[in-house]
């Protein structure tokens, strides 16, 4: 007989998720309405395509990217979809409450859906560090806390530091990475004897993870340009992101071969490193004046990503209990920091060019912004980790980590595991 959820979780999860969904429906009923001013239907379709790209990135890209575990591929894809669906709903409400609410109802536009999808993407990046060790009820908590923390961070940064939509959303890489790592640090770490094989990758799931990486690779220019204000900015962002991810693919594959004693290419390195350029270039993608700079950035990002994938997993596995194939967390933390440093360099060049004493102040503001993002990510991540450790969530036992059969019905299986 195949394994089931413990009875208490079977009672807890549907109740918790459906109650939350009912609460969200009520909030939408009382506090939201659609933007009624859409005169140009052709423009509406064009604008929707950006949101569609982001949804493809989230649902297919990040969904499949995290599906490389031998016995946890179903859960990775479906739980990602579940978190995306829930996260978008809560992010739309939260963004509306934080930015529009004083004027009355929250107006839902395609732009607010775009923002919400990007906020939900943060959870999908973070969750890579904990997938396989938590159940859906715990993931609901993680979605709510992370989307709330990110929404508040963006609001604070927007008000205190005067940053625009793009700039404050580009903290998502660093925020999501540190949030995920701090949650992972709080969860039970050691894998008991006999379950080590479950966090290993398998050929077919690894292929689907590569498919996820390909979708992310294709749509990363859309992600980096989605919140930019003018066509010239979007054009620059798309071009620079494309050049950066193109070079990081070449670097990832050749660097992976270089890093292996027999010159073999590691699937795990490639899954992650192909995206490196897009993350590193994110903050300043619209500002980079020529392709060669974006390409150099892609090269550096690819090398950092491969180097990180080679040397960091051991440390992360010991300290945080993150399996070798879940390298998105530390990858994004390094590359996100690289992106922020590049922007600070641009700030320095700008203020030096202005020839005044503003340089220290502007750099300080930028470092303050980055520090705030990291601090809020760590604090909210630790809070989430502590919440996830509560007994009420009936977390899977360590022996049942990274196992689809804990969560899914497989009719063809005669016996449990």
């Amino acid at each position: 007989m195949s394994s089931k959820y413990p009875r208490s979780v079977r009672r807890c999860l549907p109740l918790w998720a459906l109650t939350l969904e009912a609460a969200l429906i009520l909030l939408f009923y009382f506090f939201t309405h659609y933007d009624a001013s859409l005169e140009d239907q052709k423009g509406l379709v064009a604008s929707y395509q950006v949101g569609q790209d982001l949804t493809v990135m989230a649902a297919i890209g990040l969904g499949f990217l995290t599906s490389s575990f031998r016995r946890h591929s179903w859960s990775s894809v479906a739980f990602n979809l579940f978190m995306l669906a829930l996260g978008v709903q809560w992010a739309i409400l939260l963004d509306g409450f934080l930015s529009q609410f004083p004027s009355g109802k929250v107006v839902i536009t395609l732009f607010s859906i775009r923002l919400a999808t990007m906020s939900a993407l943060s959870v999908l990046i973070s969750v890579d560090a904990v997938l396989g060790k938590v159940n859906l009820a715990q993931l609901v908590v993680m979605v709510l806390v992370e989307v709330t923390a990110l929404g508040n961070l963006r609001m604070v940064i927007s008000n205190i530091f005067n940053t625009d939509y793009h700039m404050n959303m580009m903290h998502i890489y660093v925020f999501a990475a540190y949030f995920g790592l701090s949650v992972a640090w709080c969860l039970p770490k050691p894998l008991p004897e006999g379950t080590e094989d479950k966090d290993q990758t398998a050929t077919i799931p690894s292929l689907s993870a590569m498919l996820g990486a390909l979708f992310l690779w294709m749509f990363w220019p859309s992600f980096n340009s989605a919140l930019l204000r003018s066509p010239i900015e979007r054009k620059n962002a798309v071009f620079n992101t494309y050049y950066a991810v193109a070079v990081s693919v070449v670097t990832a594959i050749s660097g992976s071969s270089l890093a292996h004693p027999q010159g073999k290419i590691s699937k795990t390195y490639v899954h992650s490193a192909v995206l490196a350029g897009g993350v590193a270039v994110g903050t300043s993608c619209h500002l980079i004046p020529s392709p060669w700079l974006a390409m150099v950035l892609g090269l550096v990002a690819g090398l950092i990503s491969v180097g990180g994938a080679k040397y960091l997993p051991g440390c992360c596995n010991r300290v945080l209990g993150i399996p070798h194939s879940s390298i998105m967390g530390y990858n994004f933390s390094l590359l996100g920091l690289l992106g922020e440093i590049i922007y600070i360099v641009l700030l320095v060049l700008d203020t030096v060019g202005a020839g005044n004493g503003m340089i220290g102040f502007q750099v300080l503001l930028s470092i303050g912004e980055l520090s705030l993002a990291i601090v809020i990510a760590l604090m909210s991540g630790l809070l989430t980790g502590l919440l996830l450790n509560l007994k009420i969530w009936k977390a899977p036992h360590e022996a049942k980590y990274f196992d689809d059969q804990v969560f899914w019905k497989f009719p063809h299986l005669a016996v449990g595991f």
Partner: antibody, heavy 125, light 106 residues
């Protein structure tokens, strides 16, 4: 030649509604963000609202939030400002203006390089 | 908040005229200058603190960064009368204009 022309102004009672239109010509309208700026009699300029080039994002000055709605129809080269619950303090000349962007080293600078002639809105009982 | 000074000035043809604009917090170089004549729409003079808009005479110049900005007319001409406004675009979406400086010809 690049031109913006407002219409739809007039006299309206407090609490009433009015819709201003602005037709653009001589440039690719869909490639530019657009703004409404107003000027009360004998007063300075006050920025009112903006809309992104693709209509996906909008912003308003606090005093008109929830009452005014900016929109655009790129297929007709038209910009609109729907004004509801009008108050006496909304009396002004309303200008539509085109936004242009210039890349700096660490950020973009935006400016209003083309302005319409203005439409007069009078709110009075 | 953008504060312009003086609020009005009278100058003779050929004079050097300076108008200052102070921001309550840094706007880097995200500042524009406009000229408005009575009954007319505003006209862009300078953007990004110091870049002259095409078609604007070279006697107009802008300088400054951070919180303090200056518009200078090197040699005032009869057609330069009107009201001059500074405007920041650093804090988007809430753009703000200065209260204006009225320039009259003596």
């Amino acid at each position: 030649q690049v031109k913006l022309l407002e219409s739809g102004g007039g006299l309206v009672q407090p609490g009433g509604s009015l819709r201003l239109s602005c037709v653009a010509s001589g440039f690719t309208f869909r490639s530019y963000g657009m703004h409404w700026v107003r000027q009360a009699p004998g007063k300075g300029l006050e920025w009112v609202a903006f809309i992104w080039f693709d209509g996906s994002n909008k912003g308003y000055v606090d005093s008109v939030k929830g009452r005014f709605t900016i929109s655009r129809d790129n297929s007709k080269n038209m910009l609109y400002l729907q004004m509801n619950s009008l108050r006496a303090e909304d009396t002004a000349v309303y200008y539509c203006a085109r936004e242009k962007a210039l890349r700096g080293i660490s950020r973009y600078n935006y400016y209003l390089d083309v302005w319409g002639k203005g439409a007069t809105v009078t709110v009075s009982s | 908040v953008m504060t312009q000074s003086p609020s009005s000035l009278s100058a003779s043809i050929g004079d050097r005229v300076t108008i200052t604009c102070r921001a309550s917090q840094s706007v880097t170089r995200s500042l524009n200058w406009y000229q408005q004549k009575p009954g007319k729409a505003p006209r862009l003079l300078i953007f990004a603190a110091s870049t002259l808009q095409s078609g604007v005479p070279s006697r107009f110049s802008g300088s400054g960064s951070g919180t303090d900005f200056t518009l200078t007319i090197s040699s005032l001409q009869p057609e330069d009368f009107g009201t001059y406004y500074c405007q920041q675009n650093y804090r988007t979406p809430q753009w703000t204009f200065g209260q204006g400086t009225k320039v009259e010809i003596k």
